[in-house]
């Protein structure tokens, strides 16, 4: 987790002087509770946005937006703490909005936004906005939380972000798999414009099960420049196992930008359709 660039972040708006500060996620009001504290945020919304760094790289960011409740507690509102928790790693990053002037009621509901938390593809987060000062130990909570899911690199908008492109998202191998006679599969895919090797991972399954009945790995050496964007054709021999008929072919590239961690593409061949009605068995067996 990190913030997008380190340029001056602003939270000021007409009628409010405000500055954004780094936070330890442990506001002073936890340690020194105040008697009068503001109510919780209202209508917290988290959306996926995209933002460029000063270097021109494009990153997915969490766009956080919330409004204030229209009660007198805004007179005691000194700011807000924004926290993003990555659920899997338990990594947390916080910033603090520090109000440098007192809030006053005005004809429009106060609305705040922040779009500088960089998030990772295919990761899950919990976003919390705490109004400051935080409540006394037994006081009503004055925060609101929401979960937030970032799509993976197959998502159209994500595909062109810098982290996704670094993992090979722009490569479309357009895999085709056909079943040949004599227990073979022909796999065809488009090579990328890089001299790097590929690996084909074949996993076969029985018709209705998820336990594999056959696994095979095939190495494809790095193509020459004249072979870039060309189709590569590979014939794989299957194990002759009755019912081991559903095949998943996965292609793993080893691009220089992502090495062992590149996005894999896969295609599946289903088992042949069984006829709905089995051939009728005659009541009697002819003797001739």
């Amino acid at each position: 987790l990190r913030l997008l660039d380190h340029r001056a972040l602003v939270c000021s708006q007409p009628g409010l002087n405000c500055t954004v500060k780094n936070s330890t996620c442990l506001d002073d009001s936890w340690i020194h509770p105040r008697n009068l504290t503001p109510s919780s945020p209202k209508d917290l919304q988290i959306q996926l946005h995209f933002a460029h760094t000063q270097q021109g790289d494009l990153f997915p960011v969490a766009h956080i937006e919330w409004t204030l409740q229209t009660d007198a507690s805004i007179l005691y509102l000194e700011g807000a703490e924004l926290s993003v928790l990555q659920l899997n790693t338990n990594e947390r990053l916080c910033v603090r909005f520090e109000f440098l002037s007192k809030l006053r009621h005005h004809h429009r509901r106060w609305r705040f936004t922040f779009s500088h938390f960089v998030v990772d593809p295919d990761q899950e987060y919990e976003v919390t906005v705490h109004h400051l000062p935080k409540p006394i130990p037994d006081g009503d909570p004055n925060h609101q939380s929401k979960n937030f899911l970032v799509p993976d690199c197959e998502h159209a908008r994500m595909k062109v972000t810098t982290p996704c492109m670094s993992s090979g998202s722009l490569w479309d191998p357009n895999i085709t798999v056909e079943t040949l006679e004599a227990h073979q599969l022909r796999v065809s895919f488009t090579l990328w414009n890089e001299s790097t090797h590929y690996q084909i991972l074949l996993t076969s399954f029985p018709h209705m099960e998820n336990h594999s009945c056959f696994e095979h790995m095939h190495h494809i050496p790095a193509p020459r420049p004249e072979e870039f964007h060309q189709r590569s054709n590979v014939t794989l021999t299957l194990r002759n196992l009755k019912g081991c008929c559903r095949h998943q072919v996965q292609i793993q590239p080893f691009f220089s930008s992502c090495l062992n961690d590149c996005l894999r593409h896969s295609a599946t061949v289903s088992c042949p359709e069984m006829p709905d009605t089995p051939e009728p068995i005659p009541d009697y067996m002819p003797l001739w």
């Epitope: 919304q45 988290i46 659920l87 899997n88 790693t89 899950e124 929401k146 979960n147 899911l149």
Partner: antibody, heavy 116, light 107 residues
Framework: QVQLVQSGAEVKKPGAAVKVSCKAT????????ISWVRQAPGQGLEWMGW????????KYAQKLQGRVTMTTDTSTSTAYMELRSLRSDDTAVYYC?????????WGQGTLVTVSS | EIVMTQSPATLSVSPGERATLSCRAS??????LAWYQQKPGQAPRLLIY???TRATGIPARFSGSGSGTEFTLTISSLQSEDFAVYSC?????????FGGGTKVEIK
């Protein structure tokens, strides 16, 4: 090929405990959390909680708090869910699933029957 | 906790027809909603997340829409393999909760 393979069916007496395992293959266990979801016969799905193999952090459904423990063993890429003080209404198919909010891969399920 | 209500409980549709399934949340869950398909004796399978984004490998005949409290899963032209139970799930807040499911059966 991402796969979550669970341990076999169990029959337990009321008051006993059950420990269901879930072995992850085709990806690194620490890259994503593992969630547990159960389904009583003829009923809908019920979220039980999750564990992060990366941080060890857990989050449990309130109604199971104190009875459920989720653990992982990264050396064997296996997640475990233990449920104690079993009751007849714990009879269900227990699923492990990858991730903590939305579940993109599921185990095949483990039927736990609680009966005296 | 957020209660998810699905309707109808059972939907009878002929192959090739369109199926429209509904899911309602007891409070706003923004777009934090997923749909799953489950066939008898099998684990659920993720179809849609973010209310409208198809999961990897899911055919285009499945589409999701809605935000806030009202959501819809549409199967544009039912295939034989689509007859199953469909469940919605909110992941906006803890605890995560599922709807009771809609069974799509052959008419």
């Amino acid at each position: 090929q991402v796969q979550l393979v669970q341990s076999g069916a169990e029959v337990k007496k009321p008051g006993a405990a059950v420990k269901v395992s879930c072995k992850a293959t085709g990806y690194t266990l620490t890259s994503y959390g593992i969630s547990w979801v159960r389904q009583a016969p003829g009923q809908g799905l019920e979220w039980m909680g999750w564990i992060s193999a990366y941080s060890g952090n857990t989050k449990y459904a309130q109604k199971l708090q104190g009875r459920v423990t989720m653990t992982t063993d990264t050396s064997t890429s296996t997640a475990y869910m233990e449920l104690r003080s079993l009751r007849s209404d714990d009879t269900a198919v227990y699923y492990c699933a990858r991730k903590q909010l939305v579940f993109d891969y599921w185990g095949q399920g483990t039927l736990v029957t609680v009966s005296s | 906790e957020i209660v998810m209500t699905q309707s109808p409980a059972t939907l009878s549709v002929s192959p090739g027809e369109r199926a429209t399934l509904s899911c309602r949340a007891s409070q706003s869950v923004s777009s934090n909603l997923a749909w799953y398909q489950q066939k008898p004796g099998q684990a659920p399978r993720l179809l849609i997340y973010g209310a409208s984004t198809r999961a990897t490998g899911i055919p285009a005949r499945f589409s999701g829409s809605g935000s806030g409290t009202e959501f819809t899963l549409t199967i544009s032209s039912l295939q034989s393999e689509d007859f199953a139970v469909y469940s919605c799930q909110q992941y906006d807040n803890w605890p995560l909760t599922f709807g009771g499911g809609t069974k799509v059966e052959i008419k």
